[in-house]
Amino acid sequence: RPSFSLVEDTTLEPEEPPTKYQISQPEVYVAAPGESLEVRCLLKDAAVISWTKDGVHLGPNNRTVLIGEYLQIKGATPRDSGLYACTASRTVDSETWYFMVNVTDAISSGDDEDDTDGAEDFVSENSNNKRAPYWTNTEKMEKRLHAVPAANTVKFRCPAGGNPMPTMRWLKNGKEFKQEHRIGGYKVRNQHWSLIMESVVPSDKGNYTCVVENEYGSINHTYHLDVVERSPHRPILQAGLPANASTVVGGDVEFVCKVYSDAQPHIQWIKHVEKNGSKYGPDGLPYLKVLKHSGINSSNAEVLALFNVTEADAGEYICKVSNYIGQANQSAWLTVLPKQQAPGREKEITASPDYLE
């Protein structure tokens, strides 16, 4: 049964999905393959801590060690990448903290920004000085192992020089890499000595070798690409938001809820209210009012703005976000001060009603 009574019959489903949402990633922990990773559960006063990865119970094994509030992963592999959560169970409530683990050496070889000015990679030689190919920027080639989430773009670079100017070709797993070898093909930017593959899929896994050659010699360099598959997940809310706030009577205040969701998120701002002098209905459930929700008639749903506040506006405000997979919510308190008191930012506290996670 639902855990609240709505004060008014508000249509909760958006008539049409909003076109754009800002998304905020949870904290990301990065480790190189083979490294050990230790993460501390950032929750206080936990009687019992349980861990999950992509929504599935995480138990100790020969590589995963769970000690108190610490999670240790020994000899990390790309398969350890994913959405992790620790849940602190207390006597009266529970709280969950999310973080991402990305086991990777690098997302791409060199930065995309370099493509706007690749002059330093394209070395012009004096026509008299014949020279075999050589690498001009080995720093951009140090990362050999690339673990990349599926659907991302990958760029491998082999900046080189030589005289005459060498040519570059690419091999996949030691064989000529042809456009028809992958859906969507690939791009080669010769002036930047780069290979670009968009929207990578697991079949793109393998060794990619650039062969740079002229009549005086040939050099090569091999990258290994691993494509990490993803799983859909329920919304994630940025920790600490919305933040507690205080203002004077007649003042304005904003609550912000940063949402990370692969799928269309539906955002609701909810407040505990009183009806006929009571905070609870005859069924014992609290009365809640939906103040704002995402939909075609709603501007930026991640922000709840309150203007010309009164003392009646004081209380708890809940940002509740759902998608087809599940829900997440966080709340904050508004303190309304008499006019003579100056407002200040309050120390943030975690405040969740018992029926919300």
Epitope: E16, P17, G55, R234, Q264, Q327
Partner: antibody
Framework: QVQLVQSGAEVKKPGSSVKVSCKAS????????VHWVRQAPGQGLEWIGS????????SYNQNYKGRATITADKSTSTAYMELSSLRSEDTAVYYC???????WGQGTLVTVSS | DIQMTQSPSSLSASVGDRVTITCKAS??????IAWYQQKPGKAPKLLIY???YRYSGVPSRFSGSGSGTDFTFTISSLQPEDIATYYC?????????FGQGTKLEIK
């Protein structure tokens, strides 16, 4: 491993009700919606509704509003879908699915016949 | 409700063929589309979510693309075990609606 195990086949009279159960294991039951989808013989898939077990929030296809009731019991990690005022066209296989639709129950055949 | 129009309703192809199924949404759904495979007497199996993400363990010959209202599902090289009915579904706005299905047969 993740599993959704549904109750067995049912034969019902028109006008009666049926309650199908879906017991979840292998994941945190309260962290995912549970969806109910039905499929009439030789037909396509139709979403009935869903519930978020942690707080009981439910959402329904208007075609079933008032006739379908979806509930969840956190203590047993079980979701239920009750369909009332049954008619012959409700004869179908009823599936439960985890929120991401990545895991489905085996299906429950409900036959409505006089 | 968002209507999902899937085509063709049935198709016959040979092993090794490239097979394409399309799905059109009556309203924009961003990339909130999933594709399922269903074999007779079995529950649907998730292949693609969020239009183009292959679900874990799904063979790489299955792919999806598209955004907004027009979506495509492709099997790059048809295998005998791919004989099934395929459904698209929008998971942007409730009620989450499915296409009417495409029955795939081997020539």
């Amino acid at each position: 491993q993740v599993q959704l195990v549904q109750s067995g086949a049912e034969v019902k009279k028109p006008g009666s009700s049926v309650k199908v159960s879906c017991k979840a294991s292998g994941y945190i039951f309260t962290s995912y919606n549970v969806h109910w989808v039905r499929q009439a013989p030789g037909q396509g898939l139709e979403w009935i509704g869903s519930i978020y077990p942690d707080n009981g929030d439910s959402s329904y296809n208007q075609n079933y509003k008032g006739r379908a009731t979806i509930t969840a019991d956190k203590s047993t990690s079980t979701a239920y879908m009750e369909l009332s005022s049954l008619r012959s066209e409700d004869t179908a296989v009823y599936y439960c699915a985890r929120g991401d639709f990545a895991y489905w129950g085996q299906g429950t055949l409900v036959t409505v016949s006089s | 409700d968002i209507q999902m129009t899937q085509s063709p309703s049935s198709l016959s192809a040979s092993v090794g063929d490239r097979v394409t199924i399309t799905c059109k949404a009556s309203n924009g759904v961003s990339n909130d589309i999933a594709w399922y495979q269903q074999k007779p007497g079995k529950a649907p199996k998730l292949l693609i979510y969020s239009a183009s993400y292959r679900y874990s363990g799904v063979p790489s010959r299955f792919s999806g693309s598209g955004s907004g209202t027009d979506f495509t599902f492709t099997i790059s090289s048809l295998q005998p075990e791919d004989i099934a009915t395929y459904y698209c579904q929008q998971h942007s706005t409730t009620p989450y609606t499915f296409g009417q299905g495409t029955k795939l047969e081997i020539k």
